[in-house]
């Protein structure tokens, strides 16, 4: 009688299961008591001798490529050996590498966690993932693992992390890069500083007073609100960052506390109050303002 080793599938892909069957045509194992054993090169596989003519291999890897055969032994100790079967495990090259971010969209708050997720649509076996910063490519980290995705983490993002990033994946068929992903670090506004600017040292009624509010840090656009005794005077926008000014034609009622607020959608900050007082100099007919 002949004995055959049948591998199904016969040309497995890395990571996929394979069933080895030790087949004796025209003879059911129930027709006679047989023990079966499967071998790779010179090593027995699985449980060794068993009454089952099948052996399940949960996942085949490139290093499992080799020469396989099986043996069947009757109760009378006669051993049949199959021909050797070469099983070549096929490695799928990496393809369609992409870089995604968490949070999505590449916008992250300063101090928050940023994760750069490198993924491949296809690829088997040990895949090496590498992350690079900048179009020139400063290597940040590399990881080798048997999965289609890998992560690089920046636990607390700084302003200097705002850059373009890309990743590369490779499993023995040459490197495959992702596209560039831009990271924007969103910075909440700092506490703004309010400055009062008058055309002269002693501003008079009907002079134009400039209220200048500026937050030294914060991602644009920044919206500034101006207040007199907590009553809104108006707002000004700074689309590219920096400060903004609000002009006021002075009257006697403009004495009191002034403040401003900066808001860029990531939080609002209020300035310290600046007090503006009218003073009446001796012998002068007109009122003057001092701050």
């Amino acid at each position: 009688a002949e004995l055959f080793l049948i591998a199904s599938p016969s040309h497995p892909t890395e990571g996929s299961p394979v069933t080895l069957t030790c087949k004796m045509p025209f003879l059911q194992s129930s027709d006679a008591q047989f023990q079966f054993c499967f071998f790779r090169d010179t090593r027995a596989l699985g449980p060794g001798w068993s009454s089952s003519p099948k052996l399940q291999i949960a996942a085949m890897w490139k290093e499992d490529t080799g020469s396989y055969w099986c043996e069947a032994q009757t109760m009378a100790s006669k051993v049949l050996r199959s021909r050797r079967s070469q099983i070549n495990v096929h490695r799928v090259p990496v393809a369609d590498v992409s870089l995604e971010t968490q949070p999505p969209g590449g916008q992250v708050m300063e101090g928050d966690r940023l994760v750069l997720i490198c993924s491949v649509a296809m690829g088997t076996g040990d895949i090496t993932f590498l992350w690079y910063k900048g179009a020139v490519g400063l290597n940040l980290q590399s990881k080798t693992q048997r999965s289609l995705t890998a992560e690089y983490e920046i636990p607390s993002v700084r302003e200097s992390d705002a850059e373009q990033y890309y990743c590369v994946a490779e499993n023995g068929y040459g490197p495959s890069p992702s596209g560039l992903v831009s990271i924007t670090v969103r910075i909440p506004v700092s506490r703004p500083i309010l400055m009062l600017r008058a055309p002269r040292a002693q501003a008079a009624v009907e002079d134009v007073l400039e209220l200048h509010c500026e937050a030294l840090r914060g991602s644009p656009p920044i919206l500034y609100w101006f207040y007199h005794e907590d009553i809104t005077l108006g707002s000004r926008s700074a689309p590219s960052g920096g400060g903004a000014s609000f002009n006021l034609s002075l009257t006697e009622e403009h004495s009191g506390n002034y403040s401003c607020e900066a808001n860029n959608g990531l939080g609002a900050q209020r300035s310290e109050a600046v007090t503006l007082n009218f003073t009446v100099p001796t012998g002068a007919r007109s009122n003057h303002l001092t701050s």
Partner: antibody, heavy 119, light 108 residues
Framework: QLQLQESGPGLVKASETLSLTCTVS??????????WGWIRQPPGKGLEWIGS???????YYNPSLKSRVTISVDTSKNQFSLKLSSVTAADTAVYYC???????????WGQGTLVTVSS | EIVLTQSPGTLSLSPGERATLSCRAS???????LAWFQQRPGQAPRLFIY???SRATGIPDRFSGSGSGTDFTLTISRLEPEDFAVYYC?????????FGQGTRLEIK
């Protein structure tokens, strides 16, 4: 493309021996996973497996016909043959040769040849 | 010996309808070693399904096989005119290969 072709006399006298040959083209009969079999079909009836052979010469027969059947192989000619002795009218049938890997399902068949047993 | 019994003996249906052919074994078929063949008049049988449910090369996906143990089914989801023929099941799990007696699928 694998092809199998049966040949032999279409008429055999009762009690004599039926002899058929199957010529294989498009593949070697010595391919080490294939068995080569004979199947017959009486007119208007179903299919009956007669037996099979491996290129090494190992044979496997239907127990109901075993005492009258001999299947042999000639690897040099890429042929295998069937001999069925002591035929009767019940042996009148279309005889097919076919290939089956590991002795499993028949995936390639000849077109069949009708053998009539006359009394 | 595993005896295969096919039912019905004849099935009369119209094109476009669904056909269900049954093959029952007298004992469990080893490792699901069961195949289905189609035979048209004057032609050799043609392999359609093997290993219970795997379609042979070139067989349209309207043909499907299912079952295990002793009960097996060939289903033709939507009959085409060329599907009307005789269908045989075959088991190859032991020392004796056997065929069913066939189901004739005819146009109603």
């Amino acid at each position: 493309q694998l092809q199998l072709q049966e040949s032999g006399p279409g008429l055999v006298k009762a009690s004599e021996t039926l002899s058929l040959t199957c010529t294989v083209s498009g593949d070697s009969i010595s391919s080490n996973t294939f068995y080569w079999g004979w199947i017959r079909q009486p007119p208007g009836k179903g299919l009956e497996w007669i037996g099979s052979i491996y290129y090494s010469g190992s044979t496997y027969y239907n127990p109901s016909l075993k005492s009258r059947v001999t299947i042999s192989v000639d690897t040099s000619k890429n042929q295998f043959s069937l001999k069925l002795s002591s035929v009767t009218a019940a042996d009148t049938a279309v005889y097919y040769c076919a290939r089956h890997e590991y002795g499993d399902f028949f995936d390639y068949w000849g077109q069949g040849t009708l053998v009539t047993v006359s009394s | 010996e595993i005896v295969l019994t096919q039912s019905p003996g004849t099935l009369s249906l119209s094109p476009g309808e669904r056909a269900t052919l049954s093959c029952r074994a007298s004992q469990s078929v080893s490792s699901n070693y069961l195949a289905w063949f189609q035979q048209r008049p004057g032609q050799a049988p043609r392999l359609f399904i093997y290993g219970v449910s795997s379609r042979a090369t070139g067989i349209p996906d309207r043909f499907s096989g299912s079952g295990s143990g002793t009960d097996f089914t060939l289903t033709i989801s939507r009959l085409e005119p060329e599907d009307f023929a005789v269908y045989y099941c075959q088991q190859y799990g032991g020392s004796l290969i056997t065929f069913g007696q066939g189901t004739r699928l005819e146009i109603k």
